[in-house]
Interface confidence: low
């Protein structure tokens, strides 16, 4: 089995990931591994010479680049925050800040926007991946309520008055909790059956 550099008449190389075709000499040469770049190009008698990327630069893939890519910070103005630092083999990993979703995507997220509020009586449908899309608000299921306008508030179960030794004064709705009262407390005048003489 030939070791780079080797002649190639059909302009293809055996290992597409780790080799590339060099048209000037019509040969297959080694690519440089992740974290490195080409410091000297290959020739018919010498294979590619690779060097390690300098600090604050990277190359993610097997490559024949003569430079490393500059590490870029996550831009907080665009609503991004860092989840993993840049290394010689990987660019800075960013995600949308809490309460935001990715509004523009080009191989990676370029900027995030604030999640829409879900109105009272609803909650944001849970997604597989946080930050991938805007909120889709769904109604609270039966026996639950949510009483704020918020991008992240969850519907809570209605209070069960009997669990607290109380009785129900007013039933809960999708937007409000059950109102409980002491069983010994009289009903307010407008709710009692008193007759005026």
């Amino acid at each position: 089995q030939a070791v780079p550099p080797y002649a190639s008449e059909n302009q293809t190389c055996r290992d597409q990931e780790k080799e590339y075709y060099e048209p000037q000499h019509r040969i297959c040469c080694s690519r440089c591994p992740p974290g490195t770049y080409v410091s000297a190009k290959c020739s018919r008698i010498r294979d590619t010479v690779c060097a390690t990327c300098a600090e604050n630069s990277y190359n993610e893939h097997w490559n024949y680049l003569t430079i490393c890519q500059l590490c870029r910070p996550c831009d907080p103005v665009m609503g991004l925050e860092e989840i993993a630092p840049c290394t010689s083999k990987r660019k800075t990993q960013c995600r949308c800040q809490p309460g935001m979703f990715c509004a523009a995507w080009a191989l990676e997220c370029t900027h995030c926007e604030l999640l829409s509020d879900c109105p009272p009586g609803t909650e944001a449908e849970l997604k597989d991946e946080v930050g991938k899309g805007n909120n889709h608000c769904v109604p609270c299921k039966a026996g639950h309520f949510q009483n704020t306008s918020s991008p992240s508030a969850r519907c809570q179960p209605h209070t069960r008055c009997e669990n607290q030794g109380l009785v129900e004064a007013a039933p809960g709705t999708a937007q409000s909790d059950t109102t409980c009262k002491n069983p010994l407390e009289p009903l307010p005048p407008e709710m009692s059956g008193t007759m005026l003489m």
């Epitope: 103005v77 665009m78 609503g79 509004a103 523009a104 995507w105 900027h111 926007e113 604030l114």
Partner: nanobody, 112 residues
Framework: DVQLVESGGGLVQPGGSLRLSCKAS????????FGWYRQAPGKQRELVAT???????WYDVSVKGRFTISRDNAKNTVYLQMNSLRPEDTAVYYC??????WGQGTLVTVSS
Amino acid sequence: DVQLVESGGGLVQPGGSLRLSCKASGTTFSDRAFGWYRQAPGKQRELVATISTAGLTWYDVSVKGRFTISRDNAKNTVYLQMNSLRPEDTAVYYCNTFRGNWGQGTLVTVSS
């Protein structure tokens, strides 16, 4: 469904300027982020600039300082002001809503 119509392309000399427009219909315009992409002959489509609903902008390093993206919510239109144009800016320019909607594009040719 969202319809996008780009216009404003043409032939311009190096160093010249053009203003591209993207008119959107069939969507609540102010609720959408928009971006301008370009595709040069034989190359992949690349993102050039984006603008969020709040007006936050992002530019690719190749156009930063030369191109300006803006939006007019009243006119349902996104613009790309392109100054100091170079031959390598030659491409078909497309606008996009980041939800799979593409227009037909407008050709920009920078040549002397």
